[in-house]
Interface confidence: low
């Protein structure tokens, strides 16, 4: 009679995480008498998956009734597959022996590959806000996928980015993998409404990639531009001076008026107007009683935006002559330069 052969007809089986894997195995003879065992791996360190004779294997069920005398089907099902179950499984026939059964013949092995979906990508930006023209880094992470092959892309407002570096870990073998990518983005003044998107494509996602997003509104700081303007005279001895604070983001802003270096009033931006690009404008005014001053008055509008060092604009009022015309200070921001000859 021909010697028993252990047949594992499937060289490989591909299963999605959470599903049940069927590992097929048949013997060609009932002789010799002895049990079947299933192992993952071969040689030292192999793991026992199922023992027909004894043991408790809660995730394993047999396809047929192994207690029947003429049974030659030793296929098993493994439930709730995870990436940790991947590997090569061997169906091994043992010959009844005393005191121990002796390994008689092994099947050729079935390679179980597990497909596990990546987790939703998480995008995180820099810890501190940055201003336009600066380059900031965003990171994207996704975990738990298998197999290792994965594609990651970055977009800003639908335009694909090219300046990024991606690593898949670990570099060696693992039950599942993680991807980590860092993209560099140059900020512009129009980026308050912009979004950065990390897109992950994997064989388990069937062409429907996962996306993670970050709003640049949480990253950008657009510093204000200041303009100090003298308004028409309200009364003979009163001058109305306004400070226009334009194109700033975020809204957190405190403004202080100084008369000849002394604090006159401090206020916090509240009723701001929003521009189309998401930045804000705000205006503050100061009524100056000219008759209370014997000398020229230096008015300074000082703005502290989002906890940054204050920027200021100054405006000189000459009190030695009567007002003749309206003027404005449009000197460059942060220079503290003064425009004279207003009166």
């Amino acid at each position: 009679e021909e010697e028993l052969q252990v047949i594992q007809p499937d060289k490989s089986v591909l299963v999605a995480a959470g599903e049940t894997a069927t590992l097929r195995c048949t013997a060609t003879s009932l002789i010799p008498v002895g049990p079947i065992q299933w192992f993952r791996g071969a040689g030292p360190g192999r793991e026992l998956i199922y023992n027909q004779k004894e043991g408790h294997f809660p995730r394993v069920t047999t396809v047929s009734d192994l207690t029947k005398r003429n049974n030659m089907d030793f296929s098993i099902r493994i439930g709730n597959i995870t990436p940790a179950d991947a590997g090569t499984y061997y169906c091994v026939k043992f010959r009844k022996g005393s005191p121990d059964d002796v390994e008689f013949k092994s099947g050729a092995g079935t390679e179980l590959s597990v497909r596990a979906k990546p987790s939703a990508p998480v995008v995180s930006g820099p810890a501190a806000r940055a201003t336009p023209q600066h380059t900031v880094s965003f990171t994207c992470e996704s975990h738990g996928f298998s197999p290792r092959d994965i594609t990651l892309k970055w977009f800003k407002n639908g335009n694909e980015l090219s300046d990024f570096q991606t690593n898949v870990d670990p570099v060696g073998e693992s039950v599942s993998y993680s991807i980590h990518s860092t993209a560099k983005v140059v900020l512009t003044r129009e980026d308050v409404h912009s979004q950065v998107i990390c897109e992950v494509a994997h064989v388990t996602l069937q062409g429907d990639p996962l996306r993670g997003t970050a709003n640049l509104s949480e990253t950008i700081r657009v510093p204000p531009t200041l303009e100090v303007t003298q308004q028409p005279v309200r009364a003979e001895n009163q001058v109305n001076v306004t400070c226009q604070v334009r194109k700033f983001y975020p809204q957190r802003l405190q403004l202080t008026w100084l008369e000849n270096g002394n604090v006159s009033r401090t206020e916090t931006a509240s009723t701001v107007t929003e521009n189309k690009d998401g930045t804000y404008n705000w205006m503050s005014w100061l009524l100056v009683n000219v008759s209370a001053h014997r000398d020229d008055v230096k008015l300074t509008c000082q703005v502290e935006h989002d906890g940054q060092p204050a920027v200021s604009k100054s405006h000189d009022l000459k009190v030695s002559a009567h007002p003749k015309e309206q003027g404005s200070n449009t000197a460059a921001e942060n220079t503290g330069s003064n425009e004279r000859n207003i009166y």
Partner: antibody, heavy 122, light 107 residues
């Protein structure tokens, strides 16, 4: 039983290249990563890199990038390592060793080849 | 790269002695450490994986343990066949790195 059988000793001239082989038997070859390790005379062990036969994915120790190139012939269940621009400091025994790709622990660096001595001499 | 500092580099002992070899990792590697045995003219053999799990066929006189980033291989009672060179190997992070080796010689 799983066996890794490596090619025989090589004597090569400085500047030349050499290609070593490691044939796996006794188990499904593609289920594993094949690693290569260097041992210079009287020295310890250094990991060179590894290749995953399923898709020929490779990973290298930065120190050996440009020196070692790993390839595989799945049909022959054989992994290869080519060493280029050989110098006297490349004289060593080179081992192949295998890991299961699925296990975090039990399967790392279980099986080892007998080693191939490469002597670089003019 | 993770450095593995192994000590001692050589050790003389007698049959029946209890011997310990230590490896210190330069950073956390969890339990991902193997102990290997090398004898002249023979293939390298793995004795212990995952810090303390004994490979099949390895005598129970071999054991492994860990305290933080310090790892220890202990041979409870040296046998003649144990005289060899022993290496630790971390496989937590690529590039995988070995200790410098401990040559165990007969006193």
């Amino acid at each position: 039983e799983v066996q890794l059988v490596q090619s025989g000793a090589e004597v090569v001239k400085p500047g030349a290249s050499v290609k070593l082989s490691c044939k796996a038997s006794g188990s499904t070859f593609t289920s594993y990563w094949m690693h290569w390790v260097k041992q210079a005379p009287g020295q310890g062990l250094e990991w060179i890199g590894a290749i995953y036969p399923v898709n020929s994915d490779t990973t290298y120790n930065q120190k050996f990038k440009g020196k070692a190139t790993l390839t595989v012939d799945k049909s022959a269940s054989t992994a290869y390592m080519e060493l280029s621009s050989l110098r006297s400091e490349d004289t060593a025994v080179y081992y192949c060793t295998r890991s299961f790709y699925y296990s975090l622990d039990a399967a790392w660096f279980v099986y080892w080849g007998q080693g191939t001595l490469v002597t670089v001499s003019s | 790269d993770i450095q593995m500092t192994q000590s001692p580099s050589s050790l003389s002992a007698s049959v029946g002695d209890r011997v310990t070899i230590t490896c210190r990792a330069s950073q956390d590697i969890g339990s991902r450490l193997n102990w290997l045995q090398q004898k002249p003219g023979k293939a390298i053999k793995r004795l212990i994986y995952a810090t303390s799990s004994l490979d099949s066929g390895v005598p129970s006189r071999f054991s492994g343990s860990r305290s933080g980033t310090d790892f220890t291989l202990t041979i409870s009672s040296l046998q003649p066949e144990d005289f060899a060179t022993y290496y630790c190997l971390q496989y937590a992070s690529s590039p995988f790195t070995f200790g410098g080796g401990t040559k165990l010689e007969i006193k």
